[in-house]
């Protein structure tokens, strides 16, 4: 039995619902009483949801899953996963058994956008050209881990003296703190870009130092 799932990962935002598509081709005269459908976590083989003996056997996965009962007879074995969490990320196997059997696995990629970065400066007063300052760029509650880029006002990448740390909170979302140590010129703009590699979403923050005063756009 050929069971089909998407090749590309299903991308779902944290807190939204995701559909893991799975389909099979029922033969003429197929009845739901013949269908045995099982969704499982691929890696641990934990049961997620099942359908057997003509009945939806329900969710075995935190009561956040559902089938599409009206579409099963047409060969649609897709699974709805509600209120997606970071911990849901991974591969799900769809196993279909009628007279024949088959299975296929589909990957769920969880994502969350990063907040607009906040910029802080240390020290933040009485700055002169030649002073060394520490600029911190902070962005919150994103997933997966971010890529962080710094550049000056002319768009030249700043790669030296950058330290980036990413810490996951209890929901698995990351807070990013990136620190740039730089020697001040006469004036200058320093920009931080926090990129979510899955969503291809960029969050920008910048600080402009003009002797006195400083501005934080």
């Amino acid at each position: 039995l050929e069971v089909q799932v998407p090749e590309d990962p299903v991308v779902a935002l944290v807190g939204t619902d995701a559909t893991l598509c799975c389909s099979f081709s029922p033969e003429p005269g197929f009845s739901l009483a013949q269908l045995n459908l099982i969704w499982q976590l691929t890696d641990t083989k934990q049961l997620v949801h099942s359908f057997a003996e003509g009945q939806d056997q329900g969710s075995a996965y935190a009561n956040r899953t559902a089938l599409f009962p009206d579409l099963l007879a047409q060969g649609n074995a897709s699974l709805r996963l509600q209120r997606v969490r970071v911990a849901d990320e991974g591969s799900f196997t769809c196993f279909v058994s009628i007279r024949d059997f088959g299975s296929a696995a589909v990957s769920l990629q969880v994502a969350a956008p990063y907040s607009k970065p906040s910029m802080t400066l240390e020290p933040n007063k009485d700055l002169r050209p030649g002073d060394t300052v520490t600029i911190t760029c902070s962005s919150y509650r994103g997933y997966p881990e971010a890529e962080v880029f710094w550049q000056d006002g002319q768009g030249v990448p700043l790669t030296g003296n950058v330290t980036t740390s990413q810490m996951a909170n209890e929901q698995g979302l990351f807070d990013v703190h990136s620190v740039l140590r730089v020697v001040l010129g006469a004036n200058g703009t320093y920009s931080c870009l926090v990129r979510n590699p899955v969503l291809q979403q960029d969050a920008h923050g910048s600080v402009t130092i003009t002797g006195q005063p400083m501005t934080f756009p």
Epitope: P9, D43, S91, A105
Partner: antibody, heavy 117, light 109 residues
């Protein structure tokens, strides 16, 4: 066509190391769990190690625990088995296997490992 | 000692029906998840049966069944090309490991 192609087998002395590779094609490698299964000359099949789709879940047979390490590179569609502290009883044909649900649906052709002085 | 027990050998003449058993020796083995593999001489094993069902491409001469703590593989209309080693296997949830039976060498007389 779904294919698994093992490489890296050979002759190695007791106590030595070897790394087996398995190149996968024809399926979405990153979504599937994989295993290594071996067969000593004239003997039956013995499961060696298992790895989940992302590489975060691994299980080993007691006979190889602490000596063998299974890993994968999903960007290269490749499965690995690092074998250290090899013994004569590790001599076998090693098969790379694709798993699906509760069965092993695709097997490689195998690569031979001989441990001898 | 394997937790899945198979007879080491079996034989039959062409056209005959042969059955190979696979018995679970511990209670936590799920006989509903037993798979069977055929290994022809000098080749890699191939999936033959899962939970009494054949995957596409396997001749209907091969069938699987289960009863109590045993699973069985039956081959009807035996042919010379069926001469091979046959293995049963299952995943042991409690040990997180695959378990293979010792294998049965089938000879076509």
């Amino acid at each position: 066509e779904v294919q698994l192609l093992e490489s890296g087998g050979g002759l190695v002395q007791p106590g030595g190391s070897l790394r087996l590779s398995c190149a996968a094609s024809g399926f979405t490698f990153r979504s599937y769990a994989m295993s290594w299964v071996r067969q000593a000359p004239g003997k039956g099949l013995e499961w060696v190690a298992y790895i989940g789709s992302s590489g975060g879940t691994t299980y080993y047979a007691d006979s190889v625990k602490g000596r063998f390490t299974i890993s994968r590179d999903n960007s290269k569609n490749t499965l690995y088995l690092q074998m250290n502290s090899l013994r004569a009883e590790d001599t076998a044909v090693y098969y790379c296997v694709k798993e699906s649900y509760y069965y092993m649906d695709v097997w490689g052709q195998g690569t031979t490992v001989t441990v001898s002085s | 000692q394997s937790v899945l027990t198979q007879p080491p050998s079996a034989s039959g003449t062409p056209g005959q029906r042969v059955t190979i058993s696979c018995s679970a020796t511990i209670s936590n083995i799920d006989i509903n998840r037993v798979s069977w593999y055929q290994q022809l001489p000098g080749t890699a094993p191939k999936l033959l049966i899962f939970n009494s069902q054949r995957p596409s491409g396997v001749p209907d001469r091969f069938s699987g069944s289960k009863s109590g703590t045993s699973a069985s593989l039956a081959i009807s209309g035996l042919q010379s090309e069926d001469e091979a080693d046959y293995y049963c296997a299952t995943w042991d949830d409690s040990l997180n490991s695959w378990v293979f039976g010792g294998g049965t060498k089938l000879t076509v007389l």
